[in-house]
Amino acid sequence: SLETLKALLEVNKGHEMSPQVATLIDRFVKGRGQLDKDTLDTLTAFYPGYLCSLSPEELSSVPPSSIWAVRPQDLDTCDPRQLDVLYPKARLAFQN
């Protein structure tokens, strides 16, 4: 469940994503069959850099509310195509 995932991520809070945690998240998302808003909100809360793994097409469906807590350094590994999608959403999130 999402609550179980949150509890496991809480234990690793403040650390870089380890391969073990990456595997856990990957299996959880695949098990759900899609990346829904609740899951995305949870993942970005603990690992904001997760956004940089999403394609521009996937990012286009991310609501601004999911990225309001993301800092510029969290997007260090995003590419320009991703940032073109994220920056307008971030501006909208901050305005709200």
């Epitope: 870089e16 994503m17 380890s18 391969p19 073990q20 990456a22 595997t23 990957d26 299996r27 690992y47 850099g49 997760y50 940089c52 793994s53 999403l54 394609s55 521009p56 097409e57 996937e58 969290d74 260090d76 590994t77």
Partner: nanobody, 111 residues
Amino acid sequence: QLQLVESGGGLVQAGGSLRLSCTASGSTSMSYGAKWFRRAPGKEREWVASVYRDGTTGYDDSVKGRFTISRDLAKNTVYLQMNSLRLEDTAVYYCTALNSWGQGTQVTVSS
């Protein structure tokens, strides 16, 4: 933390080809996608190519049609096939995945 190791760089003549590899620790690390960036001497870091979580790809205009990014999930490796290399492709090439960076591999294109 995730460990990324690049290889495959070297000295090549203009017009030649190279294939860079980036291998990650962690069984599903590359299923999150990965990117190649490069830094030429005296220049800012520049994005080269990406393969995303969903398997789609993206390229900077300067390499589109010449470079191809791909991944082998079984080997946990991302590749950058570089063809028709130009002098301006000379740089240190870095792989990144899940907010981790590799140490880089030098690519030098000579005339």
